[in-house]
């Protein structure tokens, strides 16, 4: 009933709660003297389903058979309509359509930790659309059965609040859940288990790591566990890795030695626990412990390269370069590099510690045989020194690699190829490919890059520190004992026409010809390796095509003579530059009139 129903009643048969697909009979009847005032046959009873009329009848009562009601709640209201007046609400009823509960499935129970409480979950099956009460019962020792009701609309979990203890770990417990509503009831299959089956230990806590004598080879992981734990799983990985190392241990009693950790590496450690070899479940993984392993002395050797530059008749500049050790070789923070320079015949040696740089430049006499040794040091020791005898790397012409070429290979890569030297190719012990940005004036501060290649290789892909639209000077060295030969070439990974032409800064007259001087195009406007310059000239005020002279590009060249100009004729001159991709726009224009005598 949904109203005071003073004027009449609505009855529902067989029940207000019906099974989906059932038929109901709804009767609306007026109480005595509650009809229309004048003539009771004028009573018009109307039945509404929600707001929609579904039936009406003149008289004191109305019967309606209703089918096809949907799942859920449907509201029926009976109203009285009299002539010349509004409809009056008589009474109403709600009908609840649903289904009997399905058998609950997959009942499972767990107790989280030895101090936790038993909680069970199950699958309800399809929604009944009716108020359904679930009762969970747990039977066990001493003939006891604990029960708990759940009155939530969607109940699929209950915590008994009971703590199972290990006094008799083999005792059997049986759980069962029963669903009941107005249309029926259904019970799950029983789930039988022991204490050891359902207790899921809490994850280990208070995880610590100790390195005895600050050594990575003497490492022990410690943790705390609940009292009954028998098994542990340990997993650990370097923080930058996705793959875990796994270890299973029995009766660890909260400690385990790890033997395969790498030095100077941040690791993540986690531990999980279990009460029994084959019963029960593993705990969640513990919170992560992150710890860095101690340093060990570096392994491996530095990759060292050098450059020699002639200063004057008695002195030369040596620039040493080396690459950082990989993290696995450095095995710690490199504090400094030790460079030792020695004159081999006189035995003079000088040692220097370099911090913060991977290069060193010094000036030495041009006479004598010199050698260098470079090693890297961390807090635990030094790497083995890399020894190099300083020689003239390009002295042996017969060792020079032949037919060196440099071609763009995708984005920011250059493929360098060569042919072995004419001299017995088997004498080559290794090739070194060296590259640096091309800077007019041969600036020694420009970073040097190199890679080593095995003697049977005749190509190398260079990609480190390669930028688009920059020209690189590339050298290929063939090394054999204390001798070396080299060949060089210019190359770029990507090019386009230069953004500007050279700027003519002077034109001078010399013995009937002229010498044109220009400023180099700024490196950032060259847009790759320059192949040629072009000098254009034509008579002023002439419409004729200009003449031109094409000069192969050479790094150091910035002047060129022209001897085909007529005396006492005013010419306009300008220059362009070319890469493999095309020609630049004009540089500045200059006028010049040759003063010399006519031929």
């Amino acid at each position: 009933k949904i109203d005071a129903c003073k004027r009449g009643d609505v009855t529902v048969k067989p029940s207000h709660v019906i099974l989906l697909g059932s038929t109901v009979n709804i009767t609306c009847s007026l109480k005595p003297r509650q009809g229309c005032f004048h003539y009771s046959r004028r009573n018009k009873l109307i039945l509404y389903k929600f707001d929609r009329r579904i039936n009406f009848h003149h008289g004191h009562s109305l019967n309606s058979q209703v089918t096809g009601l949907p799942l859920g709640t449907t509201l029926f209201v009976c109203k009285l309509a009299c002539i010349n007046s509004d409809e009056i609400q008589i009474c109403g009823a709600e009908i609840f359509v649903g289904v009997a509960p399905e058998q609950p499935q997959n009942l499972s129970c767990i107790q989280k930790g030895e101090q936790g409480t038993v909680a069970c979950t199950w699958e309800r099956g399809r929604d009944t659309h009716l108020y359904t009460e679930y009762t969970l019962q747990l039977s066990g020792p001493k003939n006891l059965t604990w029960q708990k009701q759940c009155k939530d609309i969607y109940c699929d979990y209950l915590d008994f609040g009971i703590n199972l203890t290990p006094e008799s770990p083999e005792s059997n417990f049986t759980a069962k859940v029963t669903a009941v509503n107005s249309l029926g009831s259904s019970s799950s299959l029983p789930s039988t288990f022991t204490f050891l089956d359902i207790v899921r230990p809490l994850p280990p806590w208070d995880i610590r790591i100790k390195f005895q004598k600050a050594s990575v080879s003497r490492c022990t992981l410690y943790w705390r566990d609940e009292g009954l734990v028998l098994l542990n799983r340990l997993r650990y990985r370097p923080s930058n890795s996705r793959l875990w190392n796994m270890v299973n241990v029995t009766k660890a009693k909260g400690r385990h030695d790890l033997l395969d950790l790498k030095p100077f590496t941040e690791y993540e450690f986690q531990i999980s626990s279990k009460l029994h070899l084959y019963k029960g479940s593993w705990s969640d993984w513990s919170e992560s412990l992150r710890a860095q392993t101690p340093e060990e002395e570096p392994t491996g050797m530095l990759d060292v390269w050098y450059m020699k530059r002639h200063i004057d008749y008695s002195r030369q500049q040596i620039s040493l370069f080396w690459k950082n050790l990989s993290v696995s070789e450095a095995r710690g923070k490199i504090l400094h590099y030790q460079v030792t320079l020695q004159e081999l015949t006189g035995g003079k040696a000088m040692t220097q510690n370099i911090t913060g740089h991977t290069s060193w430049t010094t000036v030495i006499p041009r006479t004598g045989n010199w050698a260098v040794a470079v090693s890297a040091a961390n807090s635990k020791g030094s790497s083995l020194p890399t020894r190099i005898n300083i020689m003239n790397l390009c002295e042996a012409g017969l060792l020079a690699p032949r037919q060196v070429s440099a071609n763009s290979e995708g984005m920011d890569n250059i493929l360098v190829t060569w042919q072995p030297p004419r001299k017995d190719p088997s004498a080559v012990q290794e090739y070194v490919v060296e590259w640096r940005e091309l800077h007019p004036g041969g600036d020694t501060q420009v970073p040097l890059n190199w890679l080593r290649s095995r003697p049977y290789n005749v190509s190398a892909l260079i990609s480190e520190n390669i930028k688009s639209y920059i020209c690189y000077e590339i050298r290929v060295y063939a090394l054999s004992g204390d001798q070396g030969g080299c060949s060089s070439i210019l190359g770029n990974s990507k090019h386009k026409a230069p953004l500007s032409g050279p700027h003519i800064n002077a034109i001078t007259e010399e013995k009937g010809s002229i010498l044109i001087s220009w400023n180099s195009i700024p490196v950032q406007e060259q847009m790759g390796c320059l192949l040629h310059y072009r000098i254009y000239w034509k008579e002023r005020d002439s419409n004729s095509q200009p003449q031109l002279c094409e000069i192969p590009y050479r790094v150091s060249q910035n002047s060129h003579p022209i001897n085909s100009l007529q005396p006492r004729v005013t010419y306009v001159l300008w220059m362009t530059a070319l890469t493999a991709a095309g020609e630049s726009s004009h540089g500045n224009e200059r006028e010049f009139c040759l003063q010399g005598k006519a031929n």
């Epitope: 409480t117 001493k142 006891l144 604990w146 009701q149 915590d159 008994f160 009971i162 703590n163 199972l164």
Partner: nanobody
């Protein structure tokens, strides 16, 4: 300190009903497991029913289906509704409480820390 006071006992005919109350004072009751025990003259004290803090409940075999245990934490009271009483239900009824976790073995008197003075229930035939 928790004090427990039982009430609601009395004389009733066989087949009749009684509702026993166990009221707690001194501490909030909601976290406790509460049990009802009874002792007939010349017999051992025996377990009747228990209800824990999460409203899970258990009954001894001889009262199952006849007695209902419930709690009203707002009133700090636990109730034992007894119906279809039999002469063999005659005894002094005690309520008991324990604060710590509910053990499975809530049917043993040793599991409880606090006890009331008891209320007499007599069922005549």
């Amino acid at each position: 300190q928790l004090q427990l006071v039982e009430s609601g006992g009395g004389l009733v005919q066989a087949g009749g009903s009684l509702r026993l109350s166990c009221a707690a004072s001194g501490l909030t009751f909601s976290g406790y497991t509460v049990g009802w025990f009874r002792q007939a003259p010349g017999k051992e004290r025996e377990f009747v029913a228990a209800i824990n803090w999460s409203s899970a409940y258990t009954y001894s075999e001889f009262v199952k289906g006849r007695f209902t245990i419930s709690r009203d934490n707002a009133k700090n009271t636990v109730y034992l509704q007894m119906s279809s009483l039999k002469p063999e239900d005659t005894a002094v009824y005690y309520c008991a409480a324990r604060r710590s976790r509910t053990s499975w073995y809530a049917s043993t008197a040793e599991a409880y820390d606090y006890w009331g003075q008891g209320t007499q229930v007599t069922v005549s035939s």
